[in-house]
Structure formats: C-alpha cells, structure tokens
C-alpha cells in the first residue's frame, strides 16, 4: 500500500503566440480545481476505462477575477497535494490524466457551473520511494507544470511497496529467513500479512492480503473443514466410512455478499459482484465516493445529498450515464435538418448542409433565387435547395445565357426539314405529312386526318410550331 502524490506548480498560458483568454472575468469570477486519474500499465487504455489505480480531486483554488485588458496570467492554485492512495502493489508503470476544471461563482441557479479547461495525459515509469519527478504538459494554449512521486505507507517498502518491514527485535540480526530491509538496514523484512481473519493454523499466503488453505480446509478464511461424504452428490450426506473427500458447505452457501451483492464461486473461494455504491470482499463497504474516481471521460464528481446519490458525475458534452461511461450518439437524434449530414466531433456536433441550406442545424432554407439573374428574359424558379431558370423561347442553359438551337433534337418527323425561327422552330414537312412536327399523314384521297386546316394554310404548307 502507498500514496501517489501530485503537486501542481502552475497552470497558465503556454509559450508562443495565441495566449488563451482568461477563464474568469469581473462579471464571472471563478476558481480552479484539479482532478487526477491513475491507471496501471503503459497501454493506451480507452478514456472511459476506470481509474483503476485511483483518483483524487483537489480543493478549490482561490477566487480569481480577471483584470480587464490584462493577458491571462498563471492562475491561482489550490493549496496542498493531490493524494491518491493505492491499496495493492505500485505497478511501476502507470498512465495519468490530469484535468483542470473551472468553477464559476456567478449566481447561476439549477446546476453546477463547471467546465473543463484542459486535460493532459501521459504514460510514465516510476519507482515507489524515489524522488519527485517534474513534468510539463501542454493542452492547447495552456501549460501545466507539476511534480509527482509514489511513496509506500509503512510497513511497506520497496519500489513496488510489496515488501514489509518491521523494526528489529534483536540489535544484531533479523529473524530466521528474513533479510534486512535495504535501505533501512535497522529494519527487517516482516512476514507477509495475510487477509484479516485468515486462519493461522489452516491458512497461509504468498501475497499480502490473500488466504490460501492447507489441504482439508476451505472457505475464504480457511476455517471450514472439508467434509467426508458418501460422494453421492457434491453436497451429499456426510459419512465418515467411505473416506471420500468432497467439498464441504459451498463458499456461496448462505450468500456471504452483503447489500444485494451476488455471489459466484471461484476455484479458491468466492467472489461478490457488488451493486453500485458498494464494494469490498463482501460488498460490506458502502458508499463509493468521489475519492474512488467513479466518473469516467472527464466527468466531474461531487458528493450527493442522499443515499441514492452517494456520488454524482456531471458529464462533459457527449457522455452520459451515472458514471459518464456511455458515449452519446448525438447523431442518432437526427439533429441536422433538410438532409444535412451529421458529424459528432466529440466536443461538438457539426452539420454538413446540402446546397441551398445553412445554419448550425441546416435549418435555414436559402433563397435560391436571391442574387441569381436569369438572362434573356428567363424567370428563376426555387426548388430543392437549388435555383433553376425557366428560359424564354430560343434560350437555354443554367442561366438562359446560351442561344438554343431548336433543331438540334431533330424535332420534325417523317423527314421534315427544320428551320430555326426567332420564336422557335418551323418544320417543312415532306410530301404526304402535315402538322407542327410533320407527325400526321395526309390521306391519299386528299382528306386530312386533322380537322380542316385553318384558313390561309393548305395541307403541305410548313407548319409553324408555336
């Protein structure tokens, strides 16, 4: 067991251009605090994985009000160290996340006015008992300077806090099989401390806190004798005559898990799966608190006001759940209107709008015809997010700027000849055909399939297409 200690030296603008704006103002004074989350190992763990080594929240720093016009200075910091106790061995390699939070002190009603200013993360090697290590990390335009160390809590010593030491009982030497504790030569390695209550006669341990049973004994503390039985069933009636060894009462018999925990048997004993708010071997420890670092993904933990809110995680945008463990698929709510494409960038939502639409959610239908002139007497028609010109006769193209060749599509049927005309086209029909497009045959007896031709037009005259 031991403690990881973090000392924040400064938080302020980093070097280089683009100094950040002060997070506080005369209208909105604020103060800073920090959260540290530790995970074992050097692997790139998911941001939402728990702070398995522990977490801690600093006190609030002094209230700070920005001086108008002044650049953001190093901001006033909370007093004291951030301390993260660890119960087991120090892993030697660890990952950290240090978050800088701002608490606004205006008169907001209804919710905490907290916001995450900066988050830095890293992976380091560190031996327990060593000197303070100094570090500088940058997050955007901000710079965080800090030191950290891991120290063992007596009687643990060593680079992993796994060796236990006791003052010597005799002035000259340590007991049988026990070495002096370097560098504390006046102390001796102590026997391992087994799990509390582990039977001294029937149990032993190879790691601190465990309890392994000698043959013939079982149970979490090696206090339950293995019974002899008829072997007819795993929990069969006891009979000393067969000499057959079977397990005695099962480790989950009577459910040793308190507070609604569920028990499952393991090769050695049992394991309790605890409901939220409880932990410990038998779920006997109530009230997971903020010190246990229950909030993931940069969620801010505050103690609750009643037993069902033992701790509360205030989640950053994009996360939800009682521990901020769930990423919100904000695009599933289809926030982008008018067929816009939704992009969840984590810190924000973006909508990529189709042509003709604009606004944060593509909610504005642009006036497609605004500033769009259709040439040569064409008129603009809005529709579907794009403008279209309805062109006057003889003109075409997107803006009616192109002179149309009405004969290009060969509109005259049955070999009729096409002539371009200022008002459109005219078909000169081949003998035996008539109509605007020469589409009607003239009957051999001279009668037409159409009603009589209008006065002044004989069948076979070119028909003008109006």
């Amino acid at each position: 067991a031991g403690v990881f200690e973090l000392q924040i030296h400064s938080f302020g603008p980093g070097p280089g251009p683009g100094a950040p704006r002060s997070p506080c103002s005369a209208r909105l004074p604020c103060r800073l605090f920090f959260r540290v989350c530790l995970k074992p190992g050097l692997s790139e763990e998911a941001a939402e994985s728990p702070c398995a080594l522990g977490a801690a929240l600093s006190a609030r720093g002094p209230v700070y009000t920005e001086q108008p016009g002044a650049p953001a200075p190093d901001l006033p910091l909370p007093d004291g160290l951030l301390q993260v106790p660890f119960r087991d061995a120090w892993p030697g390699t660890f990952s950290f996340i240090i978050e800088t939070w701002r608490e606004e002190l205006g008169d907001q009603i209804g919710g905490p006015a907290w916001s995450l200013l900066a988050r830095v993360a890293g992976r380091r090697r560190l031996a327990a008992g060593g000197p303070w290590a100094r570090d500088i990390q940058r997050a955007g335009a901000w710079e965080l300077r800090f030191s950290y160390r891991a120290r063992c809590e007596p009687p643990a010593v060593g680079t992993a806090c796994t060796r236990l030491c006791r003052p010597r009982s005799a002035p000259s030497r340590c007991g049988p099989g026990l070495r002096p504790c370097a560098p504390l030569e006046d102390e001796c390695e102590a026997p391992l401390v087994c799990r509390a209550g582990c039977s001294p006669e029937h149990g032993f341990c190879e790691q601190p806190g465990e309890c392994r049973c000698l043959e013939g004994w079982t149970g979490p503390l090696c206090t339950v004798p293995v019974s002899t039985s008829s072997c007819l069933s795993p929990r069969g009636p006891s009979s000393a005559t067969t000499g057959c060894l079977v397990p005695g009462p099962g480790p989950c018999d009577g459910n040793p898990c308190a507070n609604g925990g569920s028990c499952s048997e393991t090769p050695r004993s049992f394991e309790c799966t605890c409901p939220r708010g409880f932990y410990g071997l038998r779920c006997e420890v109530s009230g997971v608190t903020c010190a246990d670092g229950p909030c993931f993904n940069g969620g801010l933990c505050v103690g609750g006001a009643d037993p069902d809110s033992a701790y509360i995680c205030h989640c950053p945008p994009g996360f939800q759940g009682s521990n901020c463990e769930k990423r919100v698929d904000r695009c599933s709510l289809q926030p982008c209107r008018n067929g816009g494409l939704c992009l969840d960038l984590g810190h924000a939502l973006r909508c990529r709008c189709r042509a003709g639409f604009a606004g944060p959610r593509c909610e504005h239908d642009l006036d497609d015809c605004a500033g769009r002139a259709c040439a040569n007497g064409g008129t603009c028609v809005e529709g579907g997010g794009a403008h279209r010109c309805s062109c006057a006769l003889g003109f075409g193209g997107r803006d009616c700027r192109e002179r149309a060749d009405p004969c290009a599509a060969r509109p005259c049927a049955h070999g009729g000849r096409c002539y371009a005309h200022f008002s459109g086209l005219v078909c000169a029909c081949a003998p035996g055909y008539m109509g605007a497009r020469c589409e009607f045959p003239v009957h051999p007896d001279g009668a037409s399939a159409l009603p009589a031709a209008p006065p002044g037009l004989r069948p076979g005259d070119p028909q003008r297409y109006l």
Epitope: G110, P112, S286, G287, T289, V302, G303, G304, A305, D306, P307, D308, S309, A310, I312, S322
Partner: antibody, heavy 117, light 109 residues
Amino acid sequence: EVQLVETGGGLVQPKGSLKLSCAVSAFTFTTYAMNWVRQAPGKGLEWVARIRNKSNNYATYYADSVKDRFTISRDDSQSMLYLQMNNLKIEDTAMYYCVFYYDYVYWGQGTLVTVSA
Amino acid sequence: QAVVTQESALTTSPGETVTLTCRSSTGAVTTSNYANWIQEKPDHLFTGLIGGTNNRHPGVPARFSGSLIGDKAALTITGAQTEDEAIYFCGLWYSNHLVFGGGTKLTVL
C-alpha cells in the same frame, strides 16, 4: 432550473382523504428518489415519505407517524410524484413540500393541508 | 429513531463568522449521513444551501460552507450579512430515512 410544483392541498375533515401531486421539470425525474416533507404551523420540518427509482424497485419508506395511512407513488412517464393521505388526523395539518435530494436540496413552494372538524 | 440536535438560537453581528452545528444521537455524523442544510425565511420560503455535507448550491453565496467538525456536521457563515437572518435546519440521512434537527434561529444584529 429544477422546478417542483405541489398541488392538491385543501381543507378536509378528520378521517378524510386527500391526494397531493408534485409536477417536476428540468431534470431526469426517472433517475432519482423523491421525498415529501412537511411543516406544521409554528413547528420544524418533518420528513414524511420517500420513494426510490425504478432500478431500486420503487421502494418506499415512511415516517412512523404516517405509516399505514399515507402512500407515496410516482408516475415516471409524466414526471409526477403523489402522496395519497387517508385517515387524516388534526396533527397532519401542515404545509407539504415535494423535495428532491441530489447534489443539493431542491424544494417546491408547498401546498397547505388543513385537517379540521 | 435517531434524534438530531441543533442550537435553538444564535446571535451574531454583520461581518462576523458564525458556526451552526448538527449532532446525531447515534454517534458521530459521517459523510454517510449526507448532511444537508436548509434556510427558512418568512412565508415558508425554503432554500437548499448545502447537500452531501459540503456541496454548496451554485446560487448560494460563497460565505456559506458545510463541513464535519469533530463528531458534528457544521454550517459556517463567514462574514454574516443582515439578510442571513433566518432559521437554519439540518437534515441527516439514516439509510433511507431522513431526520431533521429542530432548527437554529440565527439573528444578525
């Protein structure tokens, strides 16, 4: 802003019944436990009842003074909290408040229940 | 049934620091009692000040703070103002039952 609005108070005779309602807005009602608290005229505060959320099986708890007479319930779909009061006594006369404990304590404006012959 | 005890009345002057306490008949108050403090002003106007021992509501002035002092929960007003004159109730949770103290009448002269 969290809002709690109580209704349903009034004048009732001893042994009579009354049902109080509390409309809740601006927070995820389904997630949290809810409470009723009362204050008799000129007296201090007295906790009356508590109902937990669905994941805690809507477990209910009562002050000894109202046990077996009052019933707390909730309608998560409507974000409503209720207190059914039966067999009312003169000492139940009080201002009744819907109270929500989360990171802080949130109070409604109260509704007055008067039990009088 | 637990009993929660508060000072019945306290008097302070503007600018002074005053501490109100909340004692439990069952032993030391701990964070598992989720001590909360409520202010009552005339006309049944209740305001939650502190929840969970030391969480101050964002709308509450910074001069109010909650803590555990010895075996009691405490509400400290650093630099009392005349508008802080009110009755202050503390509430303690015992599992799923809430017990209120009798209230402290604070006078700011």
